[in-house]
């Protein structure tokens, strides 16, 4: 068996840095995606996103989203993503659980798949960065 | 204890190619970067690519696009590099190596292979 | 990709010396920076990593310090064992990019 080094104490400003370029490149990600003509969000999928049980950057489910964008990876070749879960990486903590995700069969229905969770996956980028600047200013007042 | 042991050294032909392994033991976790790196006599250290052996998802450098393949087993826990369509300057020791930590990405490769020596020939 | 300019190149200082290597990030990398010591014919040895944590079982006198995209490591009292070439090496995304490397010697 191996030990694990003492315990990495990651400034804040390191996560905010990581969080910003996973919002820019949700952006981008998202932009690619939506140049695909007649595809509708669907109900059927939905990204998990911020934990209410945890203090920022751990609130953020980052294993799942790694997950549903690695689906992505492998439905439609977005080198955007290769990025993003490197970024991802950087908040997912060694002994976290593997997400299973169910692959859609049909093309269009990949397709909505695809739409859905980039669409979320910003959506929640932002509101990652919100939670993690406010209680930045909590933590100073 | 964490070991990574690497095949032995190769002498090959321009044009062939090469594959190199890398065993690790005592090491328990998934999520992690093994990376692979080579040094060419006299040079310094050059980044050639990364694998994340839990998927076999890889990343490469440009550089060696198209020529280096690395793979992963999970199941005897080694991974490959092979690097095709060899040539004189591709003479060097190749190493690989990987991370110590509580994240997924890497800050710091912590165990290195004792390195593998290959030598191009003809 | 990210380039890690390191210098100097090579350097020459006496024993008990205060010695800095300095690498420049070509755009910011947060503290995703590592110092690995390579003494010839050996495989590299990680010292500092996370930019200024210091790997297991090196000695004090190795030190690492960030500043912007500047990146430092600092031998506080040069020994003859340190003779060595010392690289750094960025996390930030791959290509994980490697310094040029600074070869330390004795006078």
């Known amino acids: 068996s191996h030990t694990l080094p003492v315990r990495l104490l990651r400034p804040s400003d390191d996560v905010q840095k990581i969080v910003e370029e996973l919002q820019s490149l949700s952006k981008m990600l998202l932009k690619d995606v939506e140049e695909e003509k007649g595809v509708l969000v669907s109900q059927n999928y939905t990204l998990p996103c911020l934990s209410p049980d945890a203090q920022p950057p751990n609130n953020i489910h980052s294993p799942a989203i790694r997950a549903y964008l690695k689906t992505i990876r492998q439905l439609d070749n977005k080198s955007v993503i290769d990025e993003i879960i490197e970024h991802l990486d950087k908040l997912i903590f060694q002994d976290a659980p593997e997400t299973n995700i169910s692959v859609p069969t049909d093309t269009h229905e990949c397709k909505r798949f695809i739409l859905t969770i980039s669409q979320q996956f910003s959506e929640c980028m932002d509101l990652a960065l919100k939670s993690l600047t406010s209680g930045a200013q909590q933590a100073t007042t | 204890q964490v070991q990574l042991v690497q095949s032995g050294a190769e002498v090959k032909k321009p044009g062939s190619s090469v594959k190199v392994s890398c065993k690790a033991s005592g090491y328990t976790r998934t999520r992690y970067w093994m990376q692979w790196v080579r040094q060419a006599p006299g040079q310094g250290l050059e980044w050639m690519g990364a694998?994340?052996?839990?998927?076999?998802?890889?990343r490469y450098s440009q550089k060696f696009k198209g020529r280096v393949t690395i793979t992963a087993d999970k199941s005897t826990s080694t991974a490959y590099m092979e690097l095709s369509s060899l040539r004189s300057e591709d003479t060097a020791v190749y190493y690989c190596?990987?991370?110590?930590?509580?994240?997924?990405?890497?800050?710091?490769?912590?165990?290195w292979g004792q390195g593998t020596t290959v030598t191009v020939s003809s | 990709a990210i380039q890690m300019t390191q210098s100097p190149s090579s350097l020459s200082a006496s024993v008990g010396d205060r010695v800095t290597i300095t690498c420049r990030a070509s755009?910011?990398?947060?503290?995703?920076l590592a110092w690995y010591q390579q003494k010839p014919g050996k495989v590299p040895k990680l010292l500092i990593y996370?930019?200024?944590t210091s790997a297991s079982g090196v000695p004090s006198r190795f030190s690492g310090s960030r500043s912007g995209t500047d990146y430092t490591l600092t031998i506080s009292s040069l020994q003859p064992e340190d003779v060595a070439t010392y690289y750094c090496q960025h996390f930030w995304s791959t290509p994980w990019t490697f310094g040029g490397g600074t070869k330390v010697e004795i006078k």
């Open positions: 755009r910011n990398i947060g503290n995703y």
């Open positions: 190596a990987f991370p110590e930590g509580q994240y997924a990405a890497p800050y710091g490769m912590h165990y």
């Open positions: 996370y930019a200024k």
């Open positions: 694998i994340y052996p839990g998927e076999g998802d890889t």
